[in-house]
Interface confidence: medium
């Protein structure tokens, strides 16, 4: 029988009455156009909703927008359009919400064609009040807040000027012209690329990368012949044109661009691309596109310097630059990532890694599922997850995979069970152990969200027909209750809950359609009375993450340590609460060779865990030599995997070899620039 309909599913008592008392409807006095919603601050309950409606007239487009504010998690809304002088707000810029709990909001207004500059509305009190400010430029991008100081804003203008404000958008100063891309780094540093001659597009590969650490008073050139740059974790990456041809290579810096080393990655040609899939302070996942229009490439994982890379996964699906990849960081369990590969027969398969890219495997077949028509052997198949690529292909997949750091071990995703991803209507699957095992949770496609750190999962069926029913589970998706939240079904457009999955409120957004008009409507349901009491110690149980063999002393060891978590028992119906903190107990593991990667100049022969020295470095390998400070050029053959905390056990010490004797780098130094003008 379908999940949730078994005899042993206990029902939550009196839930209909409890939810009915906590269901709040708000009908918006708007013609249906588009709606965008933003949360302002953390645990403040403040939501801003911007509705916009376009009427295409013969000569121009007439636009109208309205701004609404809630301070009770969406239960009630107040029309505050008058605070922004009934101005039409540009939705493509969204609502620029300040970092942390700064309470800052910037809205960018539509202005008439002949105006000198744009217009913004600024609030620093969680949208209670707004100040109108006319800009000395027309913005090309949304205002970007410095992560360190929410008073510092930067924006690019339509004329490629880089503008900075030091007083939360009150006064603006153009600190540089001819800027292509600008990003905040740490400590209020700004990195940007600039062109000398034609334009960003024309000068691609001949850009310079500059840095300012004092908001434009002084500058430092940190890169030349730049194609693009990116920031990830503590790493700064630049893709740099090679001297002799049209290929480019990745260079990496860990000191904000003062010194650079060439990453040990293949170079790419004009039609190829690099992409930082994920980065933290320890390491980087880098995708390198294959030559030709293959739609796939290779994932490499870095060492702690971002310089030496190990091949992690072949035939990784990634369509084009800025295209689609299914690469997903499973945030509910350390070291877990899911992505898709394009197999030789052009079918798409899901792969999962539990050790930060060290090994990839197929997802285990859910026990309560049959293999579908894609399976050659009906008894042996895997779960395949639908993510961004499936959504881009307009398959019946309303949502990407979902995991939350404070809902330990829980992963929810659409999928199919077979030898590859199926184009048939998918079902929803859940894992409660970070992706090791899976269970079918719901039949058919659904929208889903996690509330109260995993204490409640909410779902709504994906349907083209109007809906009025929401499903919820208090036991990590084993059993489901249904609640009719309105008599009059609505055309559903989205679920909204406060980011961070700590809230117990869910908002259901949609519109009603009558003969003459259609209106936006939201229903906010508070589940606080379903979880009547606060969780106590007895409601939690100890769980060892990454456990695959309880008999083994090293069971659960991933990246040199294991972690035991206190997790809510599935049978406990109680509130984790907004202040819930994940309780975990780490313990260090003994080192094995698996805790080390091979350093530059060394490799692992097939089925061998030892790193052996490459017989000689010649030909193509010359390009992989390290460049920069002296310590980059010494190695003992092994290097601890980034973030690995193992101690004792195997300690692979080697004599230090000076690789300078073996090769020279072709890292682009200014001496090697062409003397011809670009």
């Amino acid at each position: 029988s379908a999940p949730g309909e078994d005899e042993e599913c206990g029902r939550v008592r009196d839930f209909v009455a409890k939810l009915a008392n906590n269901t709040h409807q708000h009908v918006f006095d708007d013609l249906r156009g588009s709606v965008s919603l933003s949360w302002v601050g953390d645990s403040t309950g403040v939501i801003l909703v911007l509705t916009t409606f376009h009427v295409p007239l013969v000569i121009m487009t007439f636009g109208q927008s309205k701004l609404y504010r809630s301070e009770d998690y969406g239960k009630n809304f107040k029309d505050i359009t008058d605070l922004i002088n009934n101005t039409f707000i540009r939705t493509e810029f969204g609502m620029a919400i300040g970092p942390e709990n700064s309470g800052k909001v910037v809205l960018t207004a539509e202005v008439s064609g002949g105006s000198r500059g744009g217009r913004i509305f600024r609030s620093s009190d969680f949208a209670k009040n707004f100040v109108q400010t006319d800009l000395p430029f027309h913005p090309l991008t949304q205002m970007m807040y410095s992560p360190q100081n929410s008073d510092y804003l930067l924006a690019l203008s339509t004329e490629n000027g880089l503008w900075v404000s030091k007083n939360f958008g009150g006064k603006w100063e153009e600190i540089h012209k001819a800027v292509c891309l600008a990003k905040w780094g740490s400590d209020n540093t700004i990195f940007f690329t600039t062109y000398a001659n034609g334009s960003c597009k024309a000068d691609l590969g001949a850009l310079e990368l500059w840095r300012t650490s004092d908001l434009g008073k002084s500058f430092k050139t940190i890169g030349v012949k730049i194609y693009s740059f990116g920031l990830g974790g503590r790493f700064l990456f630049a893709s740099v044109m090679a001297d002799k041809d049209t290929t480019r290579r990745i260079h990496v810096s860990t000191d904000q661009g003062d010194t650079w080393s060439m990453a040990q990655l293949p170079s790419v040609g004009q039609e190829q691309f690099y992409s930082i899939l994920a980065a933290n302070d320890d390491m980087v996942f880098m995708h390198v596109d294959e030559p030709g229009d293959t739609g796939f490439g290779t994932i490499f994982t870095s060492d702690d310097r971002g310089i030496v890379y190990s091949k992690s996964l072949d035939r990784h699906l990634y369509t084009t630059t800025g295209g689609e990849t299914d690469f997903t960081n499973v945030t509910s369990l350390r070291g877990v990532y899911i992505t898709s590969v394009l197999s030789e027969d052009n079918s798409i398969q899901t792969m999962i890694t539990f050790d930060q890219g060290g090994r990839w495997t197929h997802l285990r077949k859910p026990e309560n599922s049959e293999c579908d028509a894609t399976a050659k052997n009906k008894n042996e198949c895997s779960l395949h997850i639908h993510a961004s690529y499936s959504i881009s292909q307009k398959l019946n997949v309303p949502m990407a995979p979902l995991s939350e750091p404070n809902a330990v071990g829980i992963v929810i995703a659409h999928g199919s069970v077979g030898d590859a991803i199926s184009v048939m209507v998918p079902d929803v699957y859940i894992s409660d152990d970070g992706g090791y095992s899976w269970t079918k949770m719901l039949e058919g496609p659904h929208y889903y969200t996690i509330l109260d750190s995993g204490g409640i999962i909410v779902a709504i069926e994906h349907s083209s027909r109007p809906i009025n029913v929401i499903k919820f589970s208090t036991d990590e998706g084993q059993c489901w209750q249904t609640y009719t939240f309105t008599r009059d079904p609505i055309y559903f457009t989205g679920l909204a809950s406060e980011p961070g999955a700590r809230s117990m409120n869910i908002s259901i957004w949609g519109f009603t359609e009558s003969f003459l008009t259609s209106q936006w409507v939201s229903y906010t349901i508070d589940f606080k009375d379903i979880l009547e009491r606060n969780c106590e110690e007895k409601d939690y149980t100890i769980w060892l993450a990454h456990s695959t063999d309880p008999e083994d002393y090293e069971d659960g060891c991933i990246l040199g340590y294991k972690e035991q978590f206190l997790r809510l028992r599935k049978s406990s119906v109680c509130q984790n609460g907004r202040d819930y903190v994940v309780t975990k107990q780490p313990s260090i593991c003994l080192c094995s060779l698996e805790d080390f990667l091979c350093d530059f100049g060394y490799y692992r022969p097939e089925n061998d865990s030892k790193c052996v020295e490459q017989p000689e470095l010649k030909g193509h390998d010359l390009e992989f030599c390290l460049y920069g400070r002296e310590e980059h050029l010494t190695t003992n053959g092994y290097r601890k995997i980034p973030g690995d905390k193992c101690q004792g056990g195997v300690n692979p010490v080697r004599e230090v070899k000076d690789l300078k004797k073996k090769c020279t780098s072709n890292f682009l130094s200014p001496e090697k620039q062409n003397s011809k003008s670009n």
Partner: antibody, heavy 124, light 107 residues
Amino acid sequence: QVQLVQSGAEVKKPGASVKVSCKASGYTFGAYYMHWVRQAPGQGLEWMGWINPNSGFTRYAQKFQGRVTMTRDTSISTAYMELSRLRSDDTAVYYCARGKRSSGWYEGYGMDVWGQGTTVTVSS
Amino acid sequence: DIQMTQSPSSLSASVGDRVTITCRASQSISSYLNWYQQKPGKAPKLLIYAASSLQSGVPSRFSGSGSGTDFTLTISSLQPEDFATYYCQQSDVSPITFGGGTKVEIK
């Protein structure tokens, strides 16, 4: 040998413009930044800006922004510095100086080769 | 802008003396500091780059030290041809800035 040869002395009226040239020889012109530094009579050294002759990128000191233009002609290995709207306090010796190249990407390991200097006098 | 403060602004010394000139930056400039010598009517000449590296062709009696904000130029044994004005210069960031100069005169 490596040398920078600058154009001759100039006398200009206030409000006029001056264009000083600096011809490089003995090295690859495009591979080194060219800086311009001036020195008023009896005063210290004042940096005006640089040009990367390879790409044409320039960077000017804020004080001269809007008045100075640095250009180059790679075909004849020559850098130019033009200063407009001259005032009497622009009277100085103007030097071009080659940026000593590091093995990294910086403006700065000093200026290792200097031109002989061009005296510009601004007087009504 | 980064201010470079040189001291002393002038000093008198004899041939054979050990001479020390200091330069302080208003903020850290790592080791991006260079020293120049200038004689009347001549262009400056690079002596030390990157705080302590001796430019080729410069006598070994010149040495530089320091990093961050405090730097020193030392002439171990002053020679007749060393009487000149010395400038420090930071090249960490643009705008590049020079110290006010130290004039070394014959005692």
